[in-house]
């Protein structure tokens, strides 16, 4: 699986989940996150070459199409496989608010 | 929606299905295939600019790092959201068979 | 049951010829996309050659020219000659059969071993 316990320990050139941390305030200007002051949200990156952890048959076929036909423009995509939420501490007025978002930290990666 | 019926009829350069004919025997090198000779499998392409049909919160934030930090590498992809099946016709010795092939033709992108 | 059955890997000098084989079940060979990749150590699989049941063909740059791969459909095998062997070719080989019919699915053999030394 092209996740973070492969991924995070191999050099990988291909398709691979990779480690991005995001601060909320420098990075996104995002004052009203209070905690944490960031995350790894990690991303993914890399060429998805023939058979590579393929999504659907159409990135299958797309994958040995662009393998057969080098020239072509069409191919798989790495993008997110598996995500998990991030729980943050925010401020309405005075009042605290805990809230778990959805789909925040990218645990793995596919092609698409 | 980044679909067929929006983005074959405008000229648009940040993402969206884009056409792709496959003639089976040419272009992938199957000959097992009887009919269709081929068909539109489409392909996703384009950049994703922030908050271009994103698809996760990942991706809506991933979409404004890249727009506040361009020197950055990280940055959604162009993927395939809607696929539609292909049913075909190839024999087992002199026997035909018909299949449904789920997930072959591309109708609609996203930014994921 | 699919099985893919790979053979022909041994011990060679820099420069020697090895031929591989791959049989696969004929309930797929028929409609299968076949593949050889390879892993050497510590590193990742790659692909080496694949070719279509129309004879389609595809290598990798490091062995082109020096690696053929061919198919017998009376057989239902799959071979890849190797010539010109170098250390660098040494590595497990693995052969795998791609089909899309009945499912999309992707058979591999348990590989063999190549090694290229003097």
């Known amino acids: 699986a092209l996740d973070t316990n492969y991924c995070f320990r191999n050099l990988e050139e291909n398709c691979c989940v990779r480690p991005l941390y995001i601060d909320f305030r420098q990075d996104l200007g995002w004052k009203w996150v209070h905690e944490p002051k960031g995350y790894y949200a990690n991303f993914c990156s890399g060429p998805c070459p023939y058979l590579r952890s393929a999504d659907t048959t159409h990135s299958t076929v797309l994958g040995l199409y662009n393998t057969l036909n080098p020239e072509a423009s069409a191919s798989p995509c790495c993008v997110p496989q598996d995500l998990e939420p991030l729980t943050i501490l925010y401020y309405v007025g005075r009042t605290p608010k805990v809230e778990q978002l959805s789909n925040m930290v990218v645990k793995s990666c596919k092609c698409s | 929606a980044l679909d067929t019926n929006y983005c074959f009829r405008n000229l648009e350069e940040n993402c969206c299905v884009r056409p792709l004919y496959i003639d089976f025997r040419q272009d992938l090198g199957w000959k097992w295939v009887h009919e269709p000779k081929g068909y539109y499998a489409n392909f996703c392409s384009g950049p994703c600019p922030y908050l271009r049909s994103a698809d996760t919160t990942h991706s809506t934030v991933l979409g404004l790092y890249n727009t506040l930090n361009p020197e950055a590498s990280a940055s959604p992809c162009c993927v395939p959201q809607d696929l539609e099946p292909l049913t075909i016709l190839y024999y087992v010795g002199r026997t035909p068979k018909v299949e449904q092939l789920s997930n072959m033709v591309v109708k609609s992108c996203k930014c994921s | 049951e699919v099985q893919v059955v790979e053979s022909g890997g041994a011990a060679v000098q820099p420069g020697e010829s090895l031929r591989l084989s791959c049989a696969a079940s004929?309930?797929?060979?028929?409609?299968?996309?076949m593949g050889w990749f390879r892993q050497a150590p510590g590193k990742q699989r790659e692909m080496v050659a694949i070719?279509?049941?129309?004879?389609?063909?595809n290598y990798a740059d490091s062995v082109k020219g020096r690696f053929t791969i061919s198919r017998d459909a009376t057989k239902n095998t799959v071979y890849l000659q190797m010539n010109s062997l170098n250390p660098g070719d040494t590595a497990v080989y693995y052969c795998?059969?791609?089909?899309?019919?009945?499912?999309?699915?992707?058979?591999w053999g348990q590989g063999t071993q190549v090694t290229v030394s003097s």
């Open positions: 070719i279509t049941d129309g004879g389609r063909t």
């Open positions: 004929g309930s797929i060979f028929n409609t299968a996309t």
């Open positions: 795998n059969a791609l089909t899309i019919v009945p499912r999309s699915s992707i058979y």
